[in-house]
């Protein structure tokens, strides 16, 4: 059940893909990874307020009890829907290999 | 590749499953659901330090980023890994039925 | 298992236009770094490299031939295709695609040999 | 576009000899972030071409390590430790800093 597609904080406040540039460096894969040299990283960010695109009747829950307990229960948050497949240029001990990973890049988001 | 269940923290304060009391009222529910009149929810809350119970890689790539970027790349985030079934006994137009909801309460905890 | 193989006509004439489709299996193309090239070898010759295609739909030509060439795919077919246009005996040849992830080119076809004869 | 000239064009190698074969760019194959954009490949006889060694150094997964790659900027080495039957075929070098990737014209090794 996925609701409400507008954000009522405004242009681009709520749960959404974001693209953010990263190196190797930076993911900390210098070591094992030899391509590529830079990753688009396709996450999620944003605002999950009420009903924003809710996953499923959890999401729902969340949101209810956040309105009455902000102190206990969280709001909603931002996380994948579904994935993209990226693959990597790795070492490994029997020499270099493509090896796929299916949970690495955000295909689209959900509030949960 | 479910990371470190230590939590750097302290006990409890790393994401993992917490019971909220709720009544059909706290839910929004009662006008539309008969029984149960209160819910033992079940969901996720709590901390995602690094690595701690990371549910993939994109996981493991957010918190470099995050270390990185705090301001522009939110930490992971505490959410179900997976579901208990419920059954809620719920009003209808032709009068009264048993539901199963399959994504109602958390059965597990793992940030992402 | 990553398969790829080619297919076209095994003679085209002078002045006629070259359709090669690449058919593959064990990979997608519309995984993130990966992409589909081209590459001929004349008959006792090296090695040239034609064109190709990514997964986001970026292509790229070799410039001396870029105004003949037009690289395509079809990702629900697993297919990419490369037409070339008025063919010259000098273009006599076995033609390969292979699998590209960025610069990592693993996996070819087994060829498929062309002759430009009127 | 970058020129490969390999040396020798022709190589008979007594099977458990080494052999060696030489590979010159006409412009420096070292990229400013520290890699080498330098490749070879075995075409056997009768087959497609196989990638041996990836950016100048790095054996790939399944080839056996008595292949081995070094060079400079400019100028590299494929080394046979121990030459067996089944290395017969012609062995390209071809770079891929700058599009179009190029290909030496094939050095083709022979058993005596």
């Known amino acids: 059940a996925r609701n409400g597609d507008h954000c009522p904080l405004g242009p681009g406040r709520c749960c959404r893909l974001h693209t953010v540039r990263a190196s190797l460096e930076d993911l900390g894969w210098a070591d094992w990874v030899l391509s590529p040299r830079e990753v688009q990283v396709t996450m999620c960010i944003g605002a999950c307020p009420s009903q924003f695109r809710a996953a499923n009747m959890h999401a729902q829950i969340k949101t209810s009890l956040h309105r009455l307990k902000p102190d206990t229960v969280p709001a909603p948050c931002c996380v994948p829907a579904s994935y993209n497949p990226m693959v990597l240029i790795q070492k490994t001990d029997t020499g270099v290999s493509l090896q796929t990973y299916d949970d690495l890049l955000a295909k689209d988001c959900h509030c949960i | 590749a479910r990371n470190g269940d230590h939590c750097p923290l302290g006990p409890g304060r790393c994401c993992r499953l917490h019971t909220v009391r709720a009544s059909l009222e706290d839910l929004g529910w009662a006008d539309w659901v008969l029984s149960p009149r209160e819910v033992q929810v079940t969901m996720c809350i709590g901390a995602c330090p690094s690595q701690f119970r990371a549910a993939n890689m994109h996981a493991q790539i957010k918190t470099s980023l995050h270390r990185l970027k705090p301001d522009t790349v939110p930490a992971p985030c505490c959410v179900p890994a997976s579901y208990n079934p419920m059954v809620l006994i719920q009003k209808t137009d032709t009068g009264v039925s048993l539901q199963t909801y399959d994504d109602l309460l958390a059965k597990d905890c793992h940030c992402i | 298992q990553v398969t790829l193989k080619e297919s076209g006509p095994a003679l085209v004439k002078p002045t006629q236009t070259l359709t090669l489709t690449c058919t593959f299996s064990g990979f997608s193309l519309s995984t993130y770094g990966i992409g589909v090239g081209w590459i001929r070898q004349p008959p006792g010759k090296g090695l040239e490299w034609l064109a190709h295609?990514?997964?986001?739909?970026?292509?790229y030509y070799n410039t001396a031939l870029k105004s003949r060439l037009t690289i395509s795919k079809d990702t629900s077919k697993n297919q990419v295709v490369l037409t070339m246009t008025n063919m010259d005996p000098v273009d006599t040849a076995t033609y390969y695609c292979?699998?590209?992830?960025?610069?990592?080119?693993?996996?070819w076809g087994q060829g498929t040999t062309l002759t430009v004869s009127s | 576009d970058i020129v490969m000239t390999q040396t020798p064009l022709s190589l008979s190698v007594t099977p458990g000899q080494p052999a060696s074969i030489s590979c010159r760019s006409s412009k420096s194959l070292l990229h400013s972030e520290g890699i080498t954009y330098l490749y070879w490949y075995l075409q056997k006889p009768g087959q497609s071409p196989q990638l041996l060694i990836y950016?100048?150094?790095n054996l790939v997964s399944g080839v056996p390590d008595r292949f081995s790659s070094s060079g400079s900027g400019t100028d590299f080495t494929l080394k046979i430790s121990r030459v067996e039957a089944e290395d017969v075929g012609v062995y390209y070098c071809a770079q891929n800093l700058e599009l179009p990737p190029t290909f030496g014209q094939g050095t083709k090794l022979e058993i005596k």
């Open positions: 295609i990514w997964w986001n739909d970026n292509k």
């Open positions: 950016q100048m150094s």
């Open positions: 292979a699998r590209l992830a960025y610069d990592y080119v693993d996996s």
